[in-house]
Structure formats: structure tokens, C-alpha cells
């Protein structure tokens, strides 16, 4: 019987080259929470283990800075990086919980005005 | 290994208390639930309830309130279960067992220790 | 509540026969939250299989689960002389998460 919610900072957009942080909280319920792992689309980027703590994704490991809490850092935004986002809560007794985060990665705005304005 | 280890066996007369004690070790106490589980003899399984180790809130199943006290001492990695005002039907088995998920389950369990009640 | 009905309550078989082992329940169980456990005498019950057909670690190839809903089977492939005990199912789809009443498996 599943009762908890999963709060998630939704739709969020960043500037290229930057850095953003996605972040999850499960509420209403009193199930104990065992890992969280954060995923983008069918890729793993990170778990936080109970037992083990965290563990970075090699492949992401330049770019993916654990926490703040059970959150997730993203640096060097690329807009590659624009996507679906999601959090999976794994929690004794009531199971997986999934919260679900849609990133959008924009040119800087400092690239945006040079384009717009040209000199002369 | 991860294991839970339960006291002794205890005898006691209606009326009284009984305190199980239920130590983990080879994993951190507070990384994981704990349940509480009886089996009466010859009788099958009987789910009591469980506490969050790291907020320390217990769940009670109907049937199990107001008598049973789940609490945890985190300093010495040990889950205790506190049984009040004694009755002849609380003799059994009790396990402590460690929630584990996703998908649920109990995949680790204590020995057992075994209430009698009897004057 | 959900009740789980398990059969047949005792199960006569030989060493190396197949034992199919059935448990029931009164409403469908949320994503087949179910788990199987062994017990033998004098000792506390063992993991088998939870999701209502995962292995669990260090359980025999020979041990299988599966089902779906209300109907979930136990299968043991073989049956070695250790595997004569009793079986319990238990369901973590609704609150309080009930057991059945267990299969005992007994050397015919």
C-alpha cells in the first residue's frame, strides 16, 4: 500500500555550461528508504546506498557531483544534457517510488547576443 | 556477515514483562528497517510490525498495539521488543527480521527467542 | 486485510520429484510484492524468493517463482533430501502484509 509522494523540482531549464541540481523528497509516508538512484532516460548517472553510499556512474563521473542530500549535481551543462531526468526511491515496505524531472539545457546568453548583435 | 542476533529464551509469569533484544551486525542498524514477527507453537507466521531505524517511528498491525513496544538503541546497533502485562497466548517465537528493498522483503533473520508464559 | 491461501496444506513427495506449491490471494497483490520462505524445525525462516519470482542470493537454481495478481507458485525443480520443510508465502501489496498459513513438505 503504497501512501508517499514523490516532490520533484519539475521542468527546469539551465544555460549551457553551467550547472544545476536535481533534486527529489519523498513524503507521506513512513517507509524507510533504502537507495535512490538517479536516472537519465535508460541511463544510470549515480546511486546513493543506506549501506554503501554513493556511487558515480564511470562514465559520468567528471560531470556528477552527489548531493546536496539525496540530490544530484550536473556540471558543464552540454545541450546534450537536455532530457528527461528521473529519481527512483527504493523503500521498505512500500517499494519503488519515481519522480520524474524534465531538464532543458539553453545556449548562454552570452552566446545568444552575440548572435542576435552583430558588429558592424 | 550481516547478522541478527537475538537474547535468550525468557519465562515469566502473567502478568509481567519481557523485553527481546535483537543486535545487528556486518551492516549499520539505522541502513535498514527491522520487523517483528511471531510464530506461536505449531502455529504459521505473524507479521507484528516494523520501525523505521532511522526516524525510529514503529508501525503496529492491529493486534499488536498498546502492549508491544518496538524501540532501537542505535549506540549498540540493537532493536528491542517490549511485551507488557503478559498473557498466556504470548507465549511463541518471536524473530526480528531486517526489511530489505525494493521489491520488499525480510532477507535477513534473527535466531528466534521464545517467550514462555506460565504461572 | 489480504488473506493468502496456501496449498495443499501438506505435500507428499520423493527425493528428485517436482513439488508445485500453490498460494492464493483474496485480492490482487500490488506489482507482485510476494515472497516465498522455507523453515525448518527449531529454526528461523529462510529468504527464497521475493518479487514473486527473483531469487534470492544463495538460493538453488532448482527453486523458482512465478505468478501474477491473485495466483503465484513455488516450484522446486529436483527435490533434494534439505528441501523437506515448511513454506511460507507473504504478500507486501496492502498493509498489514499477511503470510499464508504454509505448505509442509513432507518425504513420501
Known amino acids: 500500500m503504497m501512501t508517499g509522494t514523490i516532490e520533484t523540482t519539475g521542468n527546469i531549464s539551465a544555460e549551457k555550461g553551467g550547472s544545476i541540481i536535481l533534486q527529489c523528497h519523498l513524503s507521506s509516508t513512513t517507509a524507510q528508504v533504502t537507495q535512490v538512484n538517479w536516472e537519465q532516460q535508460d541511463q544510470l548517472l549515480a546511486i546513493c546506498n543506506a549501506d554503501l553510499g554513493w556511487h558515480i556512474s564511470p562514465s559520468f563521473k567528471d560531470r556528477v557531483a552527489p548531493g546536496p542530500g539525496l540530490g544530484l549535481t550536473l556540471q558543464s551543462l552540454t545541450v546534450n544534457d537536455t532530457g528527461e531526468y528521473f529519481c527512483i526511491y527504493h523503500t521498505y515496505p512500500d517499494g519503488t517510488y519515481t519522480g520524474r524531472i524534465f531538464l532543458e539545457v539553453l545556449e548562454s546568453s552570452v552566446a545568444e547576443h552575440g548572435a542576435r548583435f552583430q558588429i558592424p | 556477515q550481516v547478522q541478527l542476533v537475538q537474547s535468550g529464551s525468557e519465562l515469566k509469569k502473567p502478568g509481567a514483562s519481557v523485553k527481546v533484544s535483537c543486535k545487528a551486525s556486518?551492516?549499520?542498524?539505522?541502513?535498514?528497517?527491522l520487523n517483528w514477527v511471531r510464530q506461536a507453537p505449531g502455529q504459521g507466521l505473524e507479521w507484528m510490525g516494523w520501525?523505521?531505524?532511522?526516524?525510529?517511528?514503529?508501525t503496529y498491525v492491529q493486534g499488536f498495539t498498546g502492549r508491544f513496544v518496538f524501540s532501537l538503541d542505535t549506540s549498540v546497533s540493537t532493536a528491542y521488543l517490549q511485551i507488557s502485562s503478559l498473557k498466556a497466548e504470548d507465549t511463541a517465537v518471536y524473530y526480528c527480521?531486517?526489511?530489505?528493498?525494493?521489491?520488499?522483503?525480510?532477507?535477513?533473520w534473527g535466531q528466534g527467542t521464545t517467550v514462555t508464559v506460565s504461572s | 486485510e489480504i488473506v493468502l491461501t496456501q496449498s495443499p496444506g501438506t505435500l507428499f513427495l520423493s527425493p528428485g520429484e517436482r513439488a508445485t506449491l500453490s498460494c492464493r490471494a483474496s485480492?490482487?497483490?500490488?506489482?507482485?510484492?510476494l515472497v516465498w520462505y522455507q523453515q525448518k524445525p527449531g529454526q528461523a525462516p529462510r529468504l527464497l524468493i521475493y518479487?514473486?519470482?527473483t531469487r534470492a542470493t544463495g538460493i538453488p537454481d532448482r527453486f523458482s517463482g512465478s505468478g501474477s495478481g491473485t495466483d503465484f507458485t513455488l516450484t522446486i525443480r529436483r527435490l533434494e533430501p534439505e528441501d523437506f520443510a515448511l513454506y511460507y508465502c507473504?504478500?507486501?501489496?496492502?498493509?498489514?502484509?499477511?503470510f499464508g498459513q504454509g505448505t509442509k513438505l513432507e518425504i513420501n
Open positions: 527480521a531486517r526489511g530489505y528493498s525494493s521489491p520488499p522483503r525480510m532477507d535477513v
Open positions: 556486518g551492516y549499520t542498524l539505522t541502513s535498514h528497517a
Open positions: 520501525i523505521n531505524t532511522n526516524t525510529g517511528n514503529p
Open positions: 485480492q490482487s497483490v500490488s506489482r507482485n510484492y
Open positions: 518479487g514473486a519470482s
Open positions: 507473504q504478500q507486501y501489496g496492502s498493509s498489514p502484509f499477511t
